[in-house]
């Protein structure tokens, strides 16, 4: 009767501080227009990292500004978070909402946890 | 905030027009396919018409199949329900939603009658 | 025009439990989701139990919701003066490839 999102549970952000992991999606609806968002957990409060929509014959597209790529595929949407740093470990949960045409569902993944581990300077090179 | 505001309700004859407008502001109107629900005097609510956020797909109950159409102009943040051949049974509150029927507006109404 | 049923009216005291319940078919709510929304006099619609079963944002978890079989129902507990509005709910019918509404509840704090 719902919809579920499914998402790795841990993924590790690369030294460069960009992480990736899919966000799959299934129903028994025919979605034409998908939207995706990025929420991150920490504690009790939940905040949007990005969101976009998208038609399921387009490309995901973000906002110019955002910190989020992706692309999809069916109902797989390949996110990827950029700028990521030690202080962005968390868990990150990814929101599918199906919104046109009717009927409106939405789900939402148990969370990806994402760790970021800053990388050490390089020494000085006499 | 996030806010719709319905306009373009009145009293008009059968087989008048009338064309209604939602605003919105508050969030990205562009990124989010909108709803008009009805309803009448004493009635309970009617979803009516649907569009996709680029408003090139619309869907919409058989009652008002060829009479009313949406639309939307997302430069100027708006969506639209134009009335044609108004019948007495479509006498109601107009209220726009977003598709996700987290927010509605407030409701124009229109009252047809001779 | 209303295709789930739902009682005219309720009544309830301060601080007291109500339900509302909402009745459809093995098309509509026995296949799919039941949102509920609430209406004070003279404004729009205000969503109270998403399509999900989830409280919308800002509503108290004084607000309840259950479901079995064909009839849903939402439950308010430690009714508060603010909480005297109309009750919508509503449903996607497969059949009738459509939303559909229940007729309204309207509850009355005593």
């Known amino acids: 009767k719902g919809m579920h999102a499914a998402q790795p549970a841990v993924v590790l952000a690369s030294s460069r501080g960009v992480a990736s992991f899919v966000c799959e999606y299934g129903s028994s609806g025919n979605a034409a227009e998908v939207r995706v968002t990025m929420l991150r957990q920490a504690g009790s409060q939940m905040t949007e990292v990005c969101a976009a929509t998208y038609t399921v014959e387009d490309e995901l597209a973000f906002l110019d500004d955002s910190t989020c790529t992706g692309t999809s595929s069916g109902n797989k949407v390949n996110l990827t978070i950029q700028g990521l740093r030690a202080m962005g470990t968390g868990l990150y949960i990814c929101k599918v909402e199906l919104m046109y045409p009717p009927p409106y569902y939405v789900g939402m993944g148990n969370g990806t946890q994402i760790y970021v581990i800053d990388p050490e300077p390089c020494p000085d090179s006499d | 905030e996030v806010q719709l505001v319905e306009s373009g309700g009145d009293l008009v004859k059968p087989a008048g027009s009338l064309r209604l407008s939602c605003v919105a502001s508050g969030f990205s109107f562009s990124s989010y396919a909108m709803n008009w629900v009805r309803q009448a005097p004493g009635k309970g609510l009617q979803w009516i018409a649907g569009i996709n956020s680029g408003g090139s797909s619309t869907s919409h109950i058989d009652a008002i199949k060829g009479r009313f159409t949406i639309s939307r102009d997302n430069a100027k943040n708006t969506l639209y329900l134009q009335m044609n051949s108004l019948r007495a049974e479509d006498t109601a509150v107009y209220y726009c939603a977003i598709s996700n029927w987290a927010y509605w507006g407030q409701g124009t109404l229109v009252t047809v009658s001779s | 025009q209303a295709v789930l049923n739902q009682p005219a009216s309720v009544s309830g005291s301060l601080g007291q439990r109500v339900t509302i319940s909402c009745t459809g078919s093995s098309s509509d709510i026995g296949k799919s989701y039941v949102a509920w929304y609430q209406q004070l006099p003279g404004t729009g619609p205000r969503t109270l139990i998403n399509?999900?079963?989830n409280r919308a944002s800002g509503v108290p978890d004084r607000f309840s919701v259950s479901r079995s079989g064909n009839t849903a129902t939402l439950t308010i507990s430690g009714l508060q003066a603010e909480d005297e509005a109309d009750y919508h709910c509503?449903?996607?019918?497969?059949?009738?490839?459509?939303?559909?509404f229940g007729s309204g509840t309207q509850l009355t704090i005593l």
């Open positions: 509503s449903s996607w019918d497969w059949s009738l490839h459509t939303y559909v």
């Open positions: 399509v999900d079963g």
